[in-house]
Structure formats: C-alpha cells, structure tokens
C-alpha cells in the first residue's frame, strides 16, 4: 500500500497532501515542498523531509529548529536539493551562491565554496552514534532490557532490521546507540540508518513525524524512559575534507 | 532444504519442568528472529516467546510471567524453551517458528511440533 | 495490548464456492496482518503477509485485503483441500502482547 486507503493520509510522514489520484483511485501522497510521491508504507527520505519542513509557512510550523548541542546539522536548517529518489543532492547550495558537499544524511563534509565547487558523489554515512543522555530514574536500566527495546523500537516504529542496530551501549545515564549499514549491507526496500535516525531524533524531540501513530513512548520493564538530550554523530565511507582552518 | 525440528516433549508431572529443543537446519540462524508458538489439543495458536539470536533478544507474551525461559546456542542452530512449574493447561504442542527475515513478524518456516503432555 | 478477533468461527464452503474470513484488530496495525493455514496434525503455513502479499508457493486462490483495523481472507473456487482451519495474526508488533493470532475460523467443505 501506498497510504491507508479509507481516510486517504499517510501514515509514515505528516508533512504530505493525499489524494484518492492514483491508479485506480488509489491514495497518493506528495511530499510538502517538493510535490514527489512518496511511499507511505515505509520512511520517507531525510533530504524530502527537510524540503517539506522548510516549505511550511513559519507561523503555523509546529516543527522546531534542532537544538544547538545536536550535531546533525551545525550549520542549521537548509533548504536542501533532492534527487529524483529522494536523495540529497552531492552538492548543496544557498540562495547567494554559497556551496559545499553533503553526505548521504545531508550533513556537510566540506568547506563552503562558490558555484564552482565540484561534489563528484554522494558519500555515504555508513555508521552513526546516537549519544542519548536520560532523566534520573530509581536506578539503572537493565542492559540487556534496555538493548532488546531499542532494537524493538527501531524494529517497530521505523522498520530498520535488528542487523542494522550494531550495539547499544549503557553507562548510566548515557545510552550509545549504533546504527552501521554499509553500501553493500543495503538491499532493495530496506530502511536507510540516516531517515531511521532522522524518524528517531525527531520522536526524542516530541516532534513525531508519523501520521497518527501516538508519540514515542518508551518504557524498558514499564519504566519510562525519557531523554534529556542527544546528540549525534555520523561517519562516512570517505572521511570528509576540511580545511586545517576549521579544525582548529 | 530449510527446516527447524523440535524435540523434547513428552510427559511430565504437575509441578515438573521440561526443556524443549529445536534444531534449524539449511539456514543461517543469525539472521532471522525465531518464535515458539503453542496449541493445546482443539484450540488455536498461542504466542509464547521471540528471541533475535544474534543479539540474543528476548520477548516474551505478558502471560508467560517468568515461568517459561527462550534462549539459543547460535553455533549450534538451537533454539530452547524452558518450561517451569508446569500445570495441566499447559499441555499443547509446541511449535518453533522462524520469521521471514523481514521487519514484520510473520512466520514462514515451522517446524512439526512437539508434544508436551502435563498429567499425574 | 492489540487483540485479533476473528469471525465466523466456522464456516462452511461449497466446492467451487468463495468464502470469506474476517479479522479484526483492537487498534490499528497498519498492514501488518498474516493469514495462515492449519491442517489437522500438520503445523500451520503461512498464506499472505502484509495484509495482501501472497506467500511463495501459496495459490492466487487466496486473497487478502484490509488495513488499520478490519482484514479479511478471500478464498475463490473453493476446493476439498482447503479444508482446514485459517489464523489471522497481528504482525506490527510483539511488545505487551498477549496472543498475536486470531482465535482461528474453520472452513469445511462440502
């Protein structure tokens, strides 16, 4: 299916107009912003996510900007140019001009540049560290509880296969969660770990991204479990390309 | 050819404790979750445990209470399910089941079953 | 916890006929839905997953539709060897659950 046919929405992503269009008069649904179909069966991709979530008109968005210890966008929200699949374009550029290169999350690994800046492919993130740090609770988690409901959560609510989820880590209060999924690992139909990630630092924010799903609820043995900040981490195939500048 | 075996059943006294085994064969255990599903004689299928091997995972139906324990030896592409404190309605045939390697849970693989019979 | 009911319990079929099963979940599951099949003394075999996909080897005789919260199973041109007795399960989650399945709907033909 691509959108619950009765009332005509989609359930994996809020930020679409459905309509009963399709063949057949099948419900489809178009992205906010970039007009694509998407498949509402599944994720929607992070770059048309981003697209629909800066088309929204300011003064009814009730979607926040990332928080400034979240190191998934640094350099803020964007504008950001889409492939036909969905898929961040290598190259990025602003409305004056300025340039640089993304990853496959659409995080930049380059220095900015101008229209001559050349991206010859879209690297991609194959591991990314989700560093969440949780509210005081009576006492420790259990590790192997808390590993088996993360890999549900991911399993359940985002559809990424366990073997994508590489570890979870427990040092109370901070949780380390692993997801690696390298180019070859990804077959046809299977969750990216960038748009999982994405699903899931959006729910942590209480900014569900699903249609009519409740919000993220997360209990390990019927304890909540409710963070209170995350940050996280992405590594390419290609290391990225900064100048010594910036890393000083 | 793909298949899972299940052994270990048969009669036991109120009170008593079982442990039932299921061999998988023709795949590799690790990547797919594995449930153990029930039936007591003329009713229908009841949900007992899921276990994800690799990670050794474990879900359990909320009437299991602890009674009953899912654990595997990946090496040796087994499946175990630990009956505890067992009562006469606990008599069925138990069913190991493989998922079809997806994110749902559907079960594609069964193996014949195995007959526990809790009786004085 | 989701609960799957099904109706009728039992149904009975004529050769050549079309039966359909009913399954209901206690709140939405999306397509997550399974339709299995149990012979008498066999294990059960898995027909149709997400709601409408056929399993490998299983006859274009068997259909499902449905989603959110009400499935149904459709066999057409019915036969003698589809006696048997049909499950419906939840396939979304296994989180604080109960039982997956369905109570079971035996098809007997005449």
């Known amino acids: 299916h691509t959108a619950a046919q009765d009332n005509c929405t989609c359930p994996t992503n809020k930020m679409t107009v459905c309509s009963p269009d399709g063949p057949g008069g099948r419900c489809q649904c178009r992205a906010l912003g970039s007009g694509m179909a998407v498949d509402c069966s599944t994720l929607t991709s992070k770059c048309l996510l981003l697209k629909a979530r800066m088309s929204a008109p300011k003064n009814a968005r009730t979607l926040v900007r990332p928080s400034e210890h979240a190191l998934v966008d640094n350099d803020g929200l964007y504008d950001p140019d889409c492939d036909p699949e969905g898929r961040f374009k290598a190259r990025q550029c602003n409305q004056t001009s300025v340039c640089w290169c993304v990853n496959s999350v659409g995080v930049r690994r380059t220095d900015k540049g101008d229209l001559s800046l050349r991206c010859d492919e879209l690297v991609r993130t194959h591991h990314i560290l989700i560093d969440l740090r949780h509210r005081p609770t009576a006492g420790a988690f259990n590790h192997s509880d808390l590993d088996a409901e993360l890999r549900r959560l991911f399993r359940e609510r985002y559809r990424l296969h366990p073997k994508f989820v590489a570890a979870v880590h427990y040092e109370q209060p901070t949780i380390q969660i692993e997801l690696r999924q390298n180019t070859s690992q990804k077959a046809a139909g299977d969750v990216d770990i960038g748009d999982a990630a994405y699903y899931f630092e959006r729910d942590i924010k209480g900014e569900s991204l699903f249609q009519g799903r409740g919000g993220l609820d997360l209990r390990v043995r019927g304890e909540p479990l409710q963070v209170e900040r995350t940050l996280i981490y992405y590594l390419d195939e290609i290391p990225p390309k900064f100048s010594m500048k910036r890393l000083t | 050819q793909e298949q899972l075996k299940e052994s270990g059943g048969g009669l036991v006294q109120p009170g008593g404790s079982l442990t039932l085994s299921c061999k998988a064969s023709?795949?590799?255990?690790?990547?797919?979750?594995v449930s153990w599903v029930r039936q007591a004689p003329g009713k229908g299928l009841e949900w007992i445990a899921y276990?994800?091997?690799?990670?050794?995972?474990?879900y359990y139906a909320t009437w299991v209470n602890g009674r009953f324990t899912i654990s595997s030896h990946n090496a040796q592409n087994t499946l175990y399910l630990q009956l505890n404190t067992l009562t006469a309605a606990d008599t069925a045939t138990y069913f190991c089941?493989?998922?079809?390697?997806?994110?749902?849970?559907?079960?594609?693989?069964w193996g014949p079953g195995t007959l526990v019979t809790v009786s004085s | 916890d989701v609960v799957m009911t099904q109706t009728p319990a039992s149904v009975e079929a004529a050769v050549g006929g079309t039966v359909t099963i009913n399954c209901q979940a206690s709140?939405?599951?999306?397509?997550?839905l399974a339709w299995y099949q149990q012979k008498p003394g066999q294990p059960p075999k898995l027909l149709i997953y997400?709601?409408?996909k056929l399993a490998s080897g299983v006859s274009s005789r068997f259909s499902g539709g449905g989603y959110g919260t009400e499935f149904t199973l459709t066999i057409s041109g019915v036969e003698c060897a589809d006696a048997a007795t049909y499950y419906c399960?939840?396939?979304?989650?296994?989180?604080?659950?109960?039982?997956?399945f369905g109570g079971g709907s035996e098809v007997v033909v005449k």
């Open positions: 399960q939840q396939a979304l989650t296994i989180g604080n659950v109960d039982n997956p």
């Open positions: 997400e709601a409408s």
């Open positions: 023709g795949f590799d255990f690790n990547n797919y979750g």
């Open positions: 089941a493989r998922d079809a390697g997806g994110t749902d849970y559907n079960f594609n693989l």
């Open positions: 276990i994800y091997p690799t990670y050794h995972n474990t």
């Open positions: 709140q939405s599951i999306e397509s997550y």
